[in-house]
Amino acid sequence: AGSDNPYVPCAPSPCVNGGTCRQTGDFTFECSCLPGFEGSTCERNIDDCPNHRCQNGGVCVDGVNTYNCRCPPQWTGQFCTEDVDECLLQPNACQNGGTCTNRNGGYGCVCVNGWSGDDCSENIDDCAFASCTPGSTCIDRVASFSCMCPEGKAGLLCHLDDACISNPCHKGALCDTNPLNGHYICTCPQGYKGADCTEDVDECAMTNSNPCEHAGKCVNTDGAFHCECLKGYAGPRCEMDINECHSDPCQNDATCLDKIGGFTCLCMPGFKGVHCEIEINEGNSGLNDIFEAQKIEWHENLYFQGHHHHHHHH
């Protein structure tokens, strides 16, 4: 080397990782390392993991003058000493209504009837212990089973003869088999009763009330009834009041008032009769002018009362 470039051990500093260089001779140096580093130039990160305190299977990960613990899923905290509450972390840790119980290093599930497994996800096969009659099909359900019976068999275990085979229910009734004793049960349509739905229900004899309204007369029929209505009423149960004014029976601008079983016509001045069809002849032209004016006035009043809206005459 030329004398122009004399070797200076610490210029530039050979110490890395923040180490401080100290010249110890013409050609020698010493590095003073920061905590966590070692080597002649502080090039080595000291492994801080010996005597680490990571617990419960935690893995020590070396840092600079420190270390961290990489914890298994069931543990947390600086040294993996804090238990992870899986029940809080995973609300569905236990399935199908199972109750979650946190434990150190894990969790447990208390399963409801019919479920099993670590997370209550396995449906217990109830058919393994079922006693469906041979020839029937067992269907596993949650905490139970059901037997699907072949034609002619009934009952919980398909061990009974199906009483519905002989069509004992009449009038289109629905037939079911009692799963306990095999007897048939008929669900009767409206208007019929009895074990096999052959008896007519007398709707008119029912004690609670007359099914026909407005004093209509109840007439029983097979499987049903009908109502004979009083004048002025209609409908299956005489529930509707007939509006006799609907056909405009009143004449000469008269107002029709509907009444039960009839109507009343309110005549304009100068008219009379049930339908206001008769004109009253006064024979006085002067009076006629007065009546004409009165007729308009009356007409206005009645019209307003009957229809509740303005009607202008010009």
């Epitope: 905590p35 070692e38 801080d48 010996p50 005597n51 680490h52 305190r53 420190t66 270390y67 000493t81």
Partner: antibody, heavy 118, light 112 residues
């Protein structure tokens, strides 16, 4: 920051004795605490350590079964389960100097004297 | 069990002189985590040096630590009367293989 031992006294052999180390100015959740003893005219002898964070206990091989270390939020106890005359010594409580590393002890109590004699 | 051996149980030095205290470990000290303590009669030990060579805050620079692995040295230069005390080395070992901590037997320094 300070530590102070208490509970040292004259006991007869076989009578259990508990020493207490009370700390102030720092948290036991951050620092390891060790118990060290020194028999009259003898050298220092490490008994055991309770580690911060994990609360893991380590004992010297000669001390296992003879001593029990435990702690509360502000105290560290050393129970001498069945003292013998060889357990006569001054007992020191010492704080670890670096968090997470046993390393060295940079804070010591004045010590408490235990005398075991019949 | 791990053992730290301080070869000299006592040394004497003149004021202004140099004292060297050796400490040998039966097995490698973890990451050179070796400390030196000074203890005077009736007092607890006082930390001087840790990490084999790092001076504790407030301690005189006349104290110097060196060594690695199993061999460590404490050197006191420009010895003063106040340095009269017993000096202990203390090391950290792998807890999994026995004792985590061990102290040396101590070296008493007397000033002539």
């Amino acid at each position: 920051q300070s530590v102070e031992e208490s509970g040292g006294r004259l006991v007869t052999p076989g009578t259990p004795l508990t020493l207490t180390c009370t700390v102030s100015g720092f948290s036991l959740s951050s620092y390891d605490m060790s118990w060290v003893r020194q028999a009259p005219g003898k050298g220092l002898e490490w008994i055991g350590i309770i580690q911060a964070g994990s609360n893991t206990l380590f004992y010297a091989s000669w001390a296992k079964g003879r001593f029990t270390i435990s702690k509360t939020s502000t105290t560290v106890d050393l129970k001498i389960t069945s003292p013998t005359t060889e357990d006569t010594a001054t007992y020191f409580c010492a704080r670890g100097g670096v968090i997470f590393i046993i390393g060295h002890f940079n804070l010591w109590g004045p010590g408490t004297l235990v005398t075991v004699s019949s | 069990a791990q053992v730290l051996t301080q070869t000299a149980s006592s040394v004497s030095a003149a004021v202004g002189g140099t004292v060297t205290i050796n400490c040998q470990a039966s097995q490698s000290v973890v990451n050179n985590r070796l400390a030196w303590y000074q203890q005077k009669p009736g007092q607890p030990p006082k930390l001087l040096m840790y990490g084999a060579s790092t001076l504790e805050s407030g301690v005189s620079s006349r104290f110097k630590g060196s060594g690695s692995g199993t061999q460590f040295t404490l050197t006191i230069s420009g010895v003063q009367c106040d340095d009269a005390a017993t000096y202990y080395c203390q090391g950290e070992f792998l807890c999994s293989s026995g004792d985590c901590v061990a102290f040396g037997g101590g070296t008493k320094v007397e000033i002539k």
